[in-house]
């Protein structure tokens, strides 16, 4: 039964960070440009996600603009993009795949079939986990290098985000979930052990006694 | 008044090494990345290297790579260019600028002259 | 041989509307600013255009920069005598900072 509360917080982590993932996914708060320039008087914060960038402005305004054409975003870009909703995708089938196998539910019987559906269930939310840290990492990892590099202007300098923040914990989570479901390990199959039965027959004096039968040996032709 | 001065140049032997130093004034000098940026004689600017505010990154233009260093001392206001291997292609005024905020190089000093000649 | 393509040479008439262009790639103007300079005979570069349109302190109306796509361009109306200068475009990708060839404009 302890197997089985393992399991259900497993699928609760890892479906929190499938959550978490697509809230992240969805945040327009990336990237947050450090240096908002002369002539915006007005911004507050200027902010880029990966489907639109906004201006908070102080009188509480927020203008968003969602990036229309493929053809002018980098390919940095659609390849975070991608990863993140293959990661999601990955995600919603791992939460089917995990549903089907769980002690907690009865669409399979077999305690062994579940087991091994739960353990597939985990090592897709791993996946999923990967496909939601690279891209997260990588960004930040250019935001960090950006920086630091003395090429790009301060204008153009950013900070991480929430988006980022938000995608760490729910890949985080998603890892955790999906590594103690991969801990549901097939049941041991029962062993039946063979208990020796010793068969003794009556004892008799004589000396066909050792071929434990009744007979004398003067009686055999 | 916002000012760069360059100082350093003269005439230098094939192989051999000069330092170039370029004095800044009246701006906070460490909350600025600077550059170096050489004219040939009669050709057009370009680029040689450049220097974060906190002195901790460069970069250099490819060719330059190895030969040139670039370093500043914040508490000189002071950004410097040390050069070694002089050859006679690297003839030319050096002249230092600040590298704006988007990008741009708003301030330039009036340059050093750098000849490589035996 | 510049990372930048400008003409080499330009001219017009006092008073004429004259543009040098400034053709780039995807990864320098394309995704960055862009700056122009004028550099008057034996004198130091001069900031004119930063951030692609905005004009530098003291820089007359008369000046003006644009983008479209990986290619800028600057525009000067009303064309003076005192305009006869180099004029070089700049940009900048991830690791480096690129100049233009330069174009001579010479006033007519």
């Known amino acids: 039964m302890a197997n089985a509360g393992l399991q259900l917080l497993g699928f609760i982590l890892a479906f929190l960070g499938w959550i978490g993932a697509i809230v992240s996914t969805a945040l327009p708060q990336w990237r947050i440009y450090s240096y908002a320039g002369d002539n915006i008087v007005t911004a507050q914060a200027m902010y880029e996600g990966l489907w639109m960038s906004c201006v908070s402005q102080s009188t509480g305004q927020i203008q968003c603009k969602v990036f229309d054409s493929l053809l002018n975003l980098s390919s940095t870009l659609q390849a975070t993009r991608a990863l993140m909703v293959v990661g999601i995708l990955l995600g919603v089938i791992a939460i089917f795949v995990a549903t089907v196998g769980m002690k907690c539910t009865n669409c399979v019987q077999d305690d062994t079939a579940k087991a091994k559906i739960t353990i597939v269930a985990g090592v897709l939310f791993l996946l999923a986990a990967l496909l939601t840290l690279v891209p997260v990492s990588w960004s930040a990892n250019t935001i960090i290098r950006d920086f630091y590099n003395p090429v790009v202007p301060e204008a153009q300098k950013r900070e991480m985000g929430a988006g980022l923040y938000v995608g760490w914990a729910a890949a985080a989570l998603q890892l955790l979930g999906g590594a103690l479901l991969c801990c549901s390990c097939p049941p041991r199959e029962k062993k039946y052990t063979a208990t020796k039965v010793v068969y003794s027959a009556p004892r008799s004096t004589g000396p066909g006694a050792s071929l434990g039968t009744g007979y004398d040996r003067k009686d055999y032709v | 008044e916002v000012q760069l001065l360059e100082s350093g140049g003269g005439l230098v032997q094939p192989g051999g090494s000069l330092r170039l130093s370029c004095a800044a004034s009246?701006?906070?000098?460490?909350?600025?990345?600077m550059s170096w940026v050489r004219q040939a004689p009669g050709k057009g600017l370009e680029w040689v290297s450049i220097i974060n505010p906190s002195g901790a990154s460069t970069s250099h233009a490819q060719r330059f790579q190895g030969r040139f260093t670039i370093s500043r001392d914040n508490s000189k206001n002071t950004l410097y260019l040390q050069m070694n291997s002089l050859r006679a292609e690297d003839t030319a005024v050096y002249y230092c600028?600040?590298?704006?905020?988007?990008?741009?190089?708003?301030?330039w000093g009036q340059g050093t002259l750098v000849t490589v000649s035996s | 041989q510049s990372v930048l393509t400008q003409p080499p040479s330009a001219s017009g008439t006092p008073g004429q509307r004259v543009t040098i262009s400034c053709s780039g790639s995807?990864?320098?103007?394309?995704?960055?600013?862009v700056s122009w300079y004028q550099q008057l005979p034996g004198t130091a570069p001069k900031l004119l255009i930063y951030?692609?349109?905005n004009k530098h302190f003291g820089v007359p109306d008369r000046f003006s920069g644009s983008k479209s796509g990986t290619s800028a361009s600057l525009a000067i109306s009303g064309l003076r005598s005192e305009d006869e200068a180099d004029y070089y475009c700049q940009s900048y990708d991830s690791s480096k900072v690129v100049f233009g060839g330069g174009t001579k404009l010479t006033v007519l």
């Open positions: 600028a600040r590298y704006g905020r988007y990008g741009s190089f708003d301030i």
């Open positions: 951030d692609t349109s």
């Open positions: 009246g701006f906070t000098f460490s909350s600025y990345a």
């Open positions: 995807t990864s320098n103007i394309g995704r960055n600013y």
